[in-house]
């Protein structure tokens, strides 16, 4: 039950996170005009990854797409790439995790396969979340650098005679959405990885039982090998001899070793 809950919760958290990453990537407010000494402005500028917008106090808003690829800063291109990679990995992770959900039965899919898929989707969510967090952080760093540069050059002109107020940009809503969404995706991924450990079919720890063979007495102690990776059965370490005698408390159905509340 705990494994199902952990897996389900991990899926839902990741789903919310990836939806947030998509929303953040599409949002126009990655950077917004800094209203340092003027809380009410007649012309408000804000920029996204794909276009820049101007909102006037008249209510009119005009957005212009960045219709160039080569003319854009390399950092912006890098942020775009990170966000897209995050979305793609997250989307694939979601697809994989749907089939991996314990509550969903698909044909005669083995639990080991579900464990594999859960771990795969978990890793994908972790990488997706990291990509989003990295993308947003790179953009934030770029903003901070530009902010202090424009503060230093607040008034430019010949000998400071001509007053040309430079527009400073600060963190937009999309950055916070991106950070939170990336974090959620990361948490969801970790939860999926934790759930995977419980889903993995584990070898039962048998008690040592003595079997009397003809000739001399040999005590077989089938080792309680525990699948540490969470991936399927390991034939290398698999018990070759399965003793017939078991005590009652050892009879379990897979994968219920950790399936309790």
């Amino acid at each position: 039950m705990a494994v199902t809950a952990c897996q389900g919760l991990g899926f839902v958290v990741s789903l919310i996170g990836i939806a947030g990453i998509i929303a953040a990537t599409c949002m126009d407010q990655w950077s917004t005009q800094d209203l340092y000494n003027n809380p009410v402005t007649a012309v408000f500028n804000y920029q996204g990854l794909w276009r820049s917008c101007v909102r006037e106090s008249s209510g009119f808003t005009e957005c212009r797409g960045y219709f160039t690829l080569l003319g854009l800063p390399a950092m912006l291109q890098a942020v775009r790439a990170l966000m897209i990679v995050g979305i793609v990995l997250g989307a694939i992770g979601l697809l994989v995790s749907i089939f991996a959900l314990k509550c969903i039965r698909i044909g005669s899919m083995e639990d080991s396969a579900k464990a594999n898929m859960t771990l795969t989707s978990g890793i994908m969510f972790i990488v997706s979340g990291l990509c989003a967090i990295a993308g947003v952080s790179v953009f934030a760093n770029m903003l901070v650098t530009n902010f202090w540069m424009s503060t230093a050059n607040m008034y430019t002109g010949m000998g400071g005679m001509v007053q040309t107020v430079q527009t400073r940009y600060t963190f937009g809503a999309a950055l916070f959405v991106g950070w939170v969404a990336g974090g959620l995706t990361l948490i969801g991924g970790v939860m999926m990885c934790i759930a995977c450990r419980g889903l993995a079919p584990e070898e039962t720890n048998y008690k040592a039982v003595s079997y009397h063979a003809s000739g001399h007495s040999v005590a077989y102690k089938p080792g309680g090998f525990k699948a540490s990776t969470g991936f399927g059965s390991n034939t290398k370490n698999k018990k070759i001899y399965d003793g017939g005698a078991r005590t009652e408390d050892e009879v379990q159905s897979y994968p219920s070793k950790h399936d309790y509340v």
Epitope: V40, S57, F60
Partner: antibody
Framework: EVQLVESGGGLVQPGGSLRLSCAVS?????MNWVRQAPGKGLEWVAW????????TYADDFKGRFTISRDDSKNTLYLQMNSLRAEDTAVYYC???????????WGQGTLVTVSS | DIQMTQSPSSLSASVGDRVTITCKSS????????????LTWYQQKPGKAPKLLIY???TLESGVPSRFSGSGSGTDYTLTISSLQPEDFATYYC?????????FGQGTKVEIK
Amino acid sequence: EVQLVESGGGLVQPGGSLRLSCAVSGYTFSMNWVRQAPGKGLEWVAWINMYTGEPTYADDFKGRFTISRDDSKNTLYLQMNSLRAEDTAVYYCARLTKGNGMDYWGQGTLVTVSS
Amino acid sequence: DIQMTQSPSSLSASVGDRVTITCKSSQSLLNSGNQKSYLTWYQQKPGKAPKLLIYWASTLESGVPSRFSGSGSGTDYTLTISSLQPEDFATYYCQNAYSFPFTFGQGTKVEIK
């Protein structure tokens, strides 16, 4: 078609108060009050976002004048307190449009501050 | 606050003349976000409310005759009437539409010569 009709102007004593109204019909996102003293130029008084009610004022009118709106009546107001002789002017309400220009204006209402 | 200075304060011209009015702002009205200058021009006739002629320094308001044109960027702007008509005799105002408080120029009165 946008229509703006001002009312509430008149004669008031110095230190007195007056409330101007501007009946609005048609789409307006944000509105302004602009005044013009006799024989003088245009002077912007205040702006309001008709949806949020967020206002802003010219420095000379902060604390004395209050711009507001009543959604149910579709009316814009300018509450003027502590009036002075120099506040004598024709007061216009005007709609803000693209480029922050004022495309629709009321006919104006005259406010005379005199003892 | 941004100060707006218009020149001349008045001018006399004949019908058919080309008239140029200039407006200077104490700060740039050019918005970096959309590369548009937030300067507006109005025409006002005695006893009437002002009429919007041009916004964004050079965009003609719908219904305004094409003989009116606006130009300029940064701090220097111009309103040009290519061929003055009898109905164009009025007072013209420029307005800072870039930042609050909105400020107007003192006006330029165009009179018949």
